[in-house]
Every structure is written in C-alpha cells, then in structure tokens.
Interface confidence: low
Amino acid sequence: TQNKALPENIKYGIVLDAGSSHTSLYIYKWPAEKENDTGVVHQVEECRVKGPGISKYVQKVNEIGIYLTDCMERAREVIPRSQHQETPVYLGATAGMRLLRMESEELADRVLDVVERSLSNYPFDFQGARIITGQEEGAYGWITINYLLGKFSQKTRWFSIVPYETNNQETFGALDLGGASTQITFVPQNQTTESPDNALQFRLYGKDYNVYTHSFLCYGKDQALWQKLAKDIQVASNEILRDPCFHPGYKKVVNVSDLYKTPCTKRFEMTLPFQQFEIQGIGNYQQCHQSVLELFNTSYCPYSQCAFNGIFLPPLQGDFGAFSAFYFVMNFLNLTSEKVSQEKVTEMMKKFCSQPWEEIKTSYAGVKEKYLSEYCFSGTYILSLLLQGYHFTADSWEHIHFIGKIQGSDAGWTLGYMLNLTNMIPAEQPLSTPLSHSTYV
C-alpha cells in the first residue's frame, strides 16, 4: 500500500482591516510546526465588506452587525469547523477612525464597542478591536512586505522567488497609501535619528533593525482630495470650481457641509456664500500638480531634511515597495511596470487627465463613475507625494516597486499585525523570545 502523509496541522488567523473607505477581512494559514519560520504564513482569502468604512456607521451603529455578517460567514466556511475556536480574530482600525476619534472620542469608542460585540458572536477566538497608531500601521506594513520577500531569512537563496527579490538581505522600504493617511517606513543608512518620534528599533530573527516611520494623517488620497477642494474653493469667485484634477467635461455638485465634515479640512474652513458648489473638470495635469503641491508645507523644516509639514525624513535608502492605493491607482493607469520611467509616468498622466470625461466613461465602462472620476487626481497626487513629498527623483524612481501581492498575499499592514500579535516573529534566529507588542507603542 502507498504511504499516506500524515494530515498537516494547519493553523488559521483572521485580521480585519477597518480602513477609512472600506473594511477587508483577511484569512491567513500556516503549518503549526513551522510557525516561527520566516515566510510560511500566507493569505488564503480576502473578503471585502460591502459598504463604507466603519467610521461612517457612527450614526447607525445598529447596522454594524449586518455589515460584517457576509465576510464573517465566509470565514466560517473557509476555516474548518474544528479550527474555529482556536482561530484568533483581530480588528485594526486605521486613519478613518483616528479622524473620528479626533472629532469625538466618545463616538469612536461607541463604534468600536458595537464592532467588538458583533465579532464576539462568532465561534472564533476574538482578540479585540482597536484603533492602531499611524506608527504601527507603517511598521506592520514594513514587516509584512519584508517577511513575504524573505528578507528576514538568514538562508540566502540561490534562486529568486519573486521578481523583486534579490539575494541580498537589504530590507525594502514600505510606502502605504490609504484613503485617509499615508505611511513611509524604511531603514535609513544613518542609524542615528534626529526625531525619536519617527524611530523604531526591533530585533527580528537575530538581527537588529533601526527603522524610520511616519504616518501623515489627512494625506491619504481621499482626504487629500477633500483638502484640495477646501483649499481651492476659498478662492473661487462663485459656486463654480474649475478643477484641473478632473477630466474636461466632468461635472459634480458638492455640498459645503460634506466638504467641512472631516477634521482634515478644518484648516481651510470659511464661511461661503453658498451651500453647494459645482466642480467643472478642465483636465490639466500641470495645474493639478501645482494645486496638490500647495497641500505640502515645505517652507518650514526644523531638521536637516524634511518630507513636508516640518516632519523629519532621512535620505531615502534602498528599494521600496509601494502598495495599497499606490498600487491600485498605478495599476489602473497601467503604470506599475519597472520599465516605466518617472518622466514616462508624468507624460502618461498628462495625457490621461486631458482626455474628455465622455471618452473616459466609454473606455472604462465597467468602472464605477465615482472611482473613475478620481484617477486623474489620485495619479497626480501619488506623483506629487512621491516626488515632492518624499523626495524621490527621476533616478530613484526605479527603486519604487508597485506591489499588489507577494506570493499570493496582499501587501499591507494586516499580516505583520497578526505575526506580531500571535508571537510568530521571533527576536532570535532559533526559537527564542517573540517581538513584544509594546515595541510599537
């Protein structure tokens, strides 16, 4: 008779990413006996929750349970029933909830309370819902991509398992763009930091890493657009806003009350002689770029070098993985190829933004108009953020790799978060003490 392999002891974990624009549920699995090895955890499922981000449920908390049902039921199906009780579930909320908490701690707490009560009803091992800090978001994203790229493994491979993987153990920097915040995280050349707030030290698999990280709240693509509109409407002579960041022929009515709902636009808020205004697209990349640059205060820097708004940024070092909305937007625009130079990207953006709205709608008939209309702004914003915000140049552009998935797992903070909370990243190369959660706080 044929030898039958013993059934592998598989473990599962669930992380919900409660972002500003939507919530996604990720299911991870790994062989139990290898849980301290690097690169063994992988994603088996992503379930996108229908609806907006949880912060939008502040006035209708009673609907949160229904909102989460489909994806939690999907997790019930994917994970074998025998494993349910030992499968940890974590929910991390990011900048959308940070903004809500800025407005009202009580309301943010109320949303999280209802989320926790809803998730506790499932047969999994629910470990809590919390608003993670921007620093954590950056750090966990960095851990995720380097874990998936095999950068923490001491065994150098003679082959490359992913296109970006080189045999050297130099870590990749992480560039994360969400709807409400953006993070930059990397190991700078110089280990001394001028800004302790932006410094993280941790030991992973026997090696020490001194990491720079910063999260820019209000500089995710959606909040940046609100900021830009609030800034530009200040100088509009009437209730028409001729906007270079939208395609020629595009028209949309915006309520002033919606514009000023977010704390991100408070700095531009003023009494306007109208309740609504109409965006009229003129589709000019250069003008859009100029308008976006006005969101970055680069006139003030108390350090040797800054990104913007007086935030320290050391000289860029090494390769970077750009994921989340960096990838989604650039992938839509077909600009993720390593061969596309920065000059070419700019040229393509100029061409794209100047295309008439009717033409764009016809070319991308399957795409929701709300999203479709914003790609010109988002693409321009990404270029402005990377070039003027983070000081990438035409030369260093080739060190940016737009990454959606690595080895079938989404690039993002959720995997790193789970690895840390389940103590699956040992500090030492053999099996030794796990990285403590307090490293990030």
Epitope: T133, K266, E269
Partner: antibody
Framework: QVQLVQSGAEVKKPGASVKVSCKVS????????MHWVRQAPGKGLEWMGR????????KYAEKFKNRVTMTSDTSTNTVYMELSSLRSEDTAVYYC????????????WGQGTMVTVSS | DIVLTQSPALAVSPGQRATITCRTQ??????????MNWYQQKPGQPPKLLIY???SLASGVPARFSGSGSGTDFTLTINPVEADDTANYYC????????FGGGTKVEIK
C-alpha cells in the same frame, strides 16, 4: 480679520450665575472649537472647557463639570459660557479663544471679561 | 488631566538667551504630531500665541522665539532677549483637551 468681542464686566453675589458672551466676526464659529479660559488675579491660566459649535458638542474640565454650561448660536455667531453657584474664588478674567483642529494654531482670543464675585 | 510643570521665574539681560522649560506628566505626542503650544501674556492683555505644535512659529512672531522638544520635555527659547519680552510665558498641551503650565515670569535685568 477675525475678531472675538466679549460682553462687559460683571459683579455677582455668591451663589448667583453669570453668563458671558463671545461674538465672533470675520469667520463662522462652526470653523472652530471655541474654548473658555479663566485667570484669577495674579494667577495663571485655567482651561474651563470647549464647545464645537458645528455639532453642539461640549467638553468640560473636571473641576467645572457640574457648574459650567457652554452654548452657541450660529445665527448670531456667538458662543456663551454660563457659570453657576458662584463663589469668591470664581473672581477672574474669563477669555474665549478659537482652535481650528485640536493642536493646530490657536488663532484668536477675546479681550476678556472681568467677573467679580463679592457679597 | 495632563499636568504641566514650568520653571517659575527667570531674570535675563538684554541680548542674552532665555530658556524656559516645561515638563508634561505624560506624552503630548499623538500620531507623530506634538501638541504643545507656548503663549506670552503681558499685564492686562489676553495671551498671545508664540509657538504651536512644539516648534512652529505663529504668524507675526519674531524669529527670536523658538520651540523644541517632544514627548514630555519642552523648551521655549528667546534669543536674543529684548526689553519688550518682559512677560509671563505659558506652555499649553492640546493633545488631550487643554491644560496650561503654571507660567514662567521673565524679567529683563
């Protein structure tokens, strides 16, 4: 140019209440969090609380929680601070001040209202 | 409440450097932003903002004033000091609502 103009000086008896107004011109009060700060003669600044006129949400310092009420009237662009059960220690200059988003530049202060509590 | 402790008084000659310190009993950093502000108050006047977010100079304030620090230790520096700088100086945190330090009286010799 934004200006905050407060109501005039008041003399009150212990146990009474006082209501101080702060009228904002040059911008809408809904653009700000409006704070109240007081200063007893020869003493330092003491934060009393704030109101977000956009949502009528208030936050009060623990010390004043049971005695202070902050309100706003967007039609007249005015905020109010009422302090009840007055005692002699409440004799102070009361200031209103603006804040755009917590932690960002506090742009403007009122000229102050002297409240004297004396029997 | 976050308690702020300031050095009570300081006497300094014109042209010299004045350094005022403020210590908070817990961090006033939040999301990478430091919610510490500094005010100047002269007799009979409302406070005037000098520095916000720990080190940003408020509009119209001379560059002689500068702020530094993060976490729990902060400094306001006046360099060089002028006769007109005689005043009370207050630190204020706005990370968790507002609280003020007790004030530092600066006298010009």
């Amino acid at each position: 140019q934004v200006q905050l103009v407060q109501s005039g000086a008041e003399v009150k008896k212990p146990g009474a209440s006082v209501k101080v107004s702060c009228k904002v011109s040059g911008d809408s009060i809904t653009a700000y969090f409006m704070h109240w700060v007081r200063q007893a003669p020869g003493k330092g600044l003491e934060w009393m609380g704030r109101i977000d006129p956009d949502h009528e949400r208030t936050k009060y310092a623990e010390k004043f929680k049971n005695r202070v009420t902050m309100t706003s009237d967007t039609s007249t662009n005015t905020v109010y601070m009422e302090l009840s059960s007055l005692r002699s220690e409440d004799t102070a200059v009361y200031y209103c001040a603006t804040e755009r988003v917590p932690g960002f530049e506090t742009d403007y202060w009122g000229q102050g209202t002297m409240v004297t509590v004396s029997s | 409440d976050i308690v702020l402790t300031q050095s009570p008084a300081l006497a300094v000659s014109p042209g010299q450097r004045a350094t005022i310190t403020c210590r908070t009993q817990q961090t006033v950093d939040h999301y990478g932003t430091t919610y510490m502000n500094w005010y100047q108050q002269k007799p009979g006047q409302p406070p005037k903002l000098l520095i916000y977010l720990a080190s940003s100079l408020a509009s119209g304030v001379p560059a002689r004033f500068s702020g530094s620090g993060s976490g729990t230790d902060f400094t306001l520096t006046i360099n060089p000091v002028e006769a007109d700088d005689t005043a009370n100086y207050y630190c204020q945190q706005s990370r968790n609502l507002w609280t003020f330090g007790g004030g530092t009286k600066v006298e010009i010799k």
